[in-house]
């Protein structure tokens, strides 16, 4: 509900500063509060615009302050207006000169329809002039000068709503600025009645509260609260939940409080008089000191709160036994809550006696919407109301109010909610690399839409066209490898960002699709690589019989060991060999092969081969003759790689014999590096030569080696290989 309060300080203007303060207590108006002159009540008042300023001591309050030199321009009627959700509330008040000839008994007077009413003005200045009375600026009555009484009265024996208005009194020679004002408020209904047709019964509005004729609710005087205004506020506080405070040294002294009709204006509890600067006499309390204490057990009467009941007693006169009521208090509610947009379950926790029920706890949104608890529980000391907002959004940011209203009183606690936008990546993740069972992803988590800071990141993935839930992995780096994927499967990927707080998971970002490779076919079997010429190598393999219908081909990769030269060749799948040409003579090549369909197959092991040589081979090196016996010896050697050496020839003869009497031993396996000569003669000197042969021809030995066999009985000997020049 809207709680609008207008403080008129002071209604009787002298040469002191005077002001009007309009307070929106416990709610946030949709439009600014306005303070203006009430021309409906008084047409011919001053036309000067008002200087309305923000009241710096309160969040939602406006103020007009008149300095003492402006006193002559102040007389008249004023209003304050506040609006929320299309509903407008207007509060009216007046200001008049303290030096006026007459002064009203009260600033406002609220009566019920049909009441017998006397509107009275006290004569403070005696003049030999007729007295005149106006209603809303129009003349209604005059009193001849010799008949002007001390108390000038307008009598309405049977008040009707149309009698309501601003009544003013002055001498005929005076003007607006010497007039006294009082406002009559006539409730549309008779006493204790409310409703459009005035045939519903009001609840009791205690402590001079007034029953609103349209809603049946009580409008409580400043200093009292609750559904029936039974509960006194803490000292010097006012408002529907008593959370506004009078900052003066003597509390609410000199503050005239004006509330929405039909309440009108009154002093705060404990004060009386037109200026609200007179304390109540002993035994009296309440607004304008109109309430009399009749404390049952002789309890003390407090002019602000009434009877101060002894422990175990309660009620206005301490007439009821029971645990004293305790004003509800809202606990454990932080001043500021950061909330992620989406579902929100605010909690309002309150103490008090009796404990608040779920009907008595509400939550008011910044736009004035009143929420009721979705869930409720209570312990011995606290009531806990849980509210549900299914979708809270950034526009819901602002001041929310937890409100508790029990028979023991009312309390409201505003708190600020800041609704954050959940983060969402602007870009889809990028696929850097894929295999048949893995993918390397750049998650592209920035830039993102929404609010940070980002607490964590998730990469979500799932096969397309599968009714599987999204799987996810927590990600810390921008580059991540997804493993254990299915081969030849289309996946979709997206990134979800998580910000701090409950429900911080943002909506997943844009989706990227990719397909894993098929599991590759095995490499060709029986691979063999042989030189064909100085510039060609021949690669052969066994025929391939694929298990699927898919087209396939053999990919052959060859690269030179000596040079950075690489070539990939595609060979139709029905072939079993490929000639690798345009090679360099006497060069070593590494070759591997795989069988590809749409997916790439597995590479074979590397095969190496040399192209045939374009020069004669070098002589074998490190020639040694060892293990010499009377009839045998072992010859060993090494050859250089890369000269297409196909065979080694060992030529030996008895020294001194003719050339044509030599024996040639041809070793056709060039990988063999030693040979045992057998059937030699004992104690005989042999001349031994060794040649390497390749496609060009034989190597040229620089010298021959000598071998002398042992006598028949001697142990074997090693010969370092004495050299004999040829």
């Amino acid at each position: 509900a809207m709680d609008l309060i207008l403080i008129n300080s002071l209604p009787l203007v002298s040469d002191a500063e005077t002001s009007l303060t309009c307070i929106a207590s416990g709610w946030r108006p949709h439009e600014p509060i306005t303070i203006g002159r009430d021309f409906e009540a008084l047409m011919n008042q001053h036309q000067d615009p008002l200087e309305v300023t923000q009241d710096v001591t309160r969040e939602w309050a406006k103020k007009v302050v008149w300095k003492r030199e402006k006193a002559s321009k102040i007389n008249g009627a004023y209003f304050c207006e506040g609006r929320v959700r299309g509903e407008a509330i207007r509060i009216r008040t007046m200001k008049m000169r303290q030096q006026a000839s007459f002064l009203p008994a009260t600033l406002t007077m609220t009566v019920d329809k049909g009441d017998n009413v006397n509107i009275s003005f006290k004569k403070v200045l005696i003049k030999e002039e007729d007295a005149v009375i106006y209603k809303n600026g129009s003349f209604i009555h005059s009193v001849p000068r010799h008949e002007v009484p001390d108390i000038l009265e307008v009598h309405l024996p049977h008040a009707q709503p149309q009698d309501a208005g601003v009544y003013s009194a002055r001498y005929i020679g005076g003007n607006l600025f010497t007039s006294a004002f009082t406002r009559l408020i006539v409730r549309r209904c008779e006493a204790q009645k409310w409703g459009p047709e005035c045939n519903h019964l009001c609840t009791a509005c205690m402590n001079n509260g007034v029953c609103h004729e349209d809603t049946g609710e009580c409008i409580c005087p400043p200093g009292f609260m609750g559904r029936t205004c039974e509960k006194a506020c803490e000292l010097h506080t006012f408002g529907r939940t008593c959370k506004e405070r009078c900052s003066g040294q003597e509390g609410c002294k000199s503050y005239v409080f004006c509330l929405p009709d039909p309440y009108g204006c009154s002093c705060a509890t404990g004060w009386k008089g037109l200026q609200c600067n007179e304390a109540c006499h002993p035994g009296f309390y309440g607004p304008d000191c109109k309430l009399r204490c009749s404390c049952n057990n002789g309890e003390m009467c407090d002019r602000f709160q009434g009877c101060l009941c002894s422990p175990g007693w309660q009620g206005l006169q301490c007439e009821r036994e029971g645990i004293p009521r305790m004003t509800p208090k809202i606990v454990d509610l932080p001043d500021h809550i950061e909330v992620n947009s989406g579902k929100f379950n605010p909690i309002c926790k309150a103490s008090g006696w009796p404990l608040p029920t779920n009907e008595e706890m509400t939550l008011v949104k910044p736009d004035g919407t009143v929420l009721h608890p979705k869930d409720f529980n209570h312990t011995d000391h606290f009531s806990v109301a849980i509210f549900t907002i299914h979708r809270i959004l950034p526009p819901d940011s602002g001041v929310w109010v937890c409100s508790v209203n029990t028979v023991a009183g009312m309390v409201e606690k505003p708190f600020n909610i800041s609704v954050k936008v959940l983060p969402k990546p602007l870009n889809a993740p990028n696929v850097i690399d894929t295999g048949h069972n893995f993918a390397v992803i750049n998650i592209s988590s920035e830039p993102y839409f929404g609010d940070g800071p980002i607490k964590s990141k998730k990469l979500l993935y799932k096969p397309v066209n599968h009714y599987e839930a999204w799987q996810h992995i927590q990600v810390t780096n921008e580059i991540v490898t997804l493993n254990y994927l299915e081969p030849r499967t289309e996946y979709e990927l997206c990134v979800q960002l998580v910000r701090r707080g409950e429900g911080g998971e943002g909506h997943p970002g844009p989706v990227r699709r990719f397909t894993t490779a098929s599991i590759g076919l095995p490499p060709p079997r029986g691979l063999n690589l042989l030189p064909k010429s100085q510039t060609t190598l021949n690669l052969t393999w066994q025929p391939i019989f694929p298990s699927s219908e898919d087209d396939f081909y053999v990919e052959v990769e060859r690269r030179s060991v000596q040079k950075s030269d690489q070539q990939n060749i595609k060979v139709p799948g029905n072939l079993t060999s490929v000639l690798l040409n345009n090679l360099h003579p006497r060069e070593q090549y590494v070759v591997r092969a795989r069988v590809n369909t749409k997916a790439q197959g597995e590479w074979s092991e590397d095969l190496t081969a040399w192209t045939l040589s374009d020069i004669l081979p070098p002589q074998p090196e490190n020639i040694k003759i060892s293990n010499i016996t009377h009839s045998s010896a072992v010859i060993s050697w090494t050859i250089l790689d890369g000269y297409s050496i196909s065979s080694i020839t060992i030529r030996y003869k008895v020294q001194g014999k003719n050339e044509d009497q030599h024996v040639d031993v041809k070793i056709k396996n060039a990988t063999i590096t030693q040979y045992q000569l057998k059937g030699l003669e004992p104690e005989t000197a042999y001349q031994v030569d060794i040649f390497a042969e390749n496609n060009i021809g034989s190597s040229n030995p620089a010298f021959s080696h000598e071998l002398v066999t042992l006598p028949e009985s001697q142990a074997p000997a090693d010969l370092g290989g004495g050299k004999m020049l040829l």
Epitope: E87, Q192, G195, L201, C202, T203, A204, G216, E217, E230
Partner: antibody, heavy 117, light 113 residues
Framework: QVQLVQSGGGVVQPGRSLRLSCAAS????????MHWVRQAPGKGLEWVAV????????YYADSVKGRFTISRDNSKNMLQLQMNRLRSEDTAVYYC??????????WGQGTVITVSS | DIQMTQSPDSLAVSLGERATINCKSS????????????LAWYQQKPGQPPNLLMY???TRESGVPDRFSGSGSGTDFTLTISSLQAEDVAVYYC?????????FGQGTRLEIK
């Protein structure tokens, strides 16, 4: 917790009288107007009577006017409905209730009255 | 007296579906001065007293789930349950409090289809 506990129901012959009571707790009973509403078996709700918080004002449905009397004892937090010259059409579940504005917010558990010969 | 007429008399709706109950008053219950409709809705389960759901035609009472909503103005009003739950099976009544005596509709029985 606000509670309204009803008593006094039963079976009664046509033309006889019966008194229903409603005891209130958890609220300042003396501050609230109180209503009686009834519901005939298998039928809808029918408002019967209302009394102001101080007992000064009382209103009745035409169907019970002159036969039923609503009263209250604020010192005992008690509401009563004195039903005289009962008729068979008065057979119903009777509820006491507290208003929230013009809606009825808190209801008693109900008490069954059967008027039968 | 203002007459209140509800329609339909009974209604069967599947769980999770929307249920709509109408209420018509013989004269307007909208008060132009404050633009409020003086209409309330109640739910009554077997063997229990009625439970206030809505007042001022569209203001939800404390503790009432937000699947219940009230709308309408003047003479035509609607109570809507956006997604019917098993516990919503009951009789629903509208009531005007524009004028005394307060009067109720004849009730609408809501069941699960």
């Amino acid at each position: 917790q606000v509670q309204l506990v009803q008593s006094g129901g039963g079976v009664v012959q046509p033309g006889r009288s019966l008194r229903l009571s409603c005891a209130a707790s958890g609220l300042t009973f003396a501050n609230y107007a109180m209503h009686w509403v009834r519901q005939a078996p298998g039928k809808g709700l029918e408002w019967v009577a209302v009394i102001s918080y101080d007992g000064e004002n009382k209103y009745y449905a035409d169907s019970v006017k002159g036969r039923f009397t609503i009263s209250r004892d604020n010192s005992k937090n008690m509401l009563q409905l004195q039903m005289n010259r009962l008729r068979s059409e008065d057979t119903a579940v009777y509820y006491c209730a507290t208003p929230k504005g013009g809606a009825l917010e808190i209801w008693g558990q109900g008490t069954v009255i059967t008027v039968s010969s | 007296d203002i007459q209140m007429t509800q329609s339909p008399d009974s209604l069967a709706v599947s769980l999770g579906e929307r249920a709509t109950i109408n209420c018509k008053s013989s004269q307007s219950v909208l008060y132009s001065s404050n633009n409020k409709n003086y209409l309330a809705w109640y739910q009554q389960k077997p063997g229990q007293p009625p439970n206030l759901l809505m007042y001022w035609a569209s203001t939800r009472e404390s503790g009432v789930p937000d699947r219940f909503s009230g709308s309408g103005s003047g003479t035509d009003f609607t109570l809507t349950i956006s997604s019917l739950q098993a516990e919503d099976v009951a009789v629903y009544y509208c009531q005007q409090y524009y004028s005394a005596p307060i009067t109720f509709g004849q009730g609408t029985r809501l069941e699960i289809k």
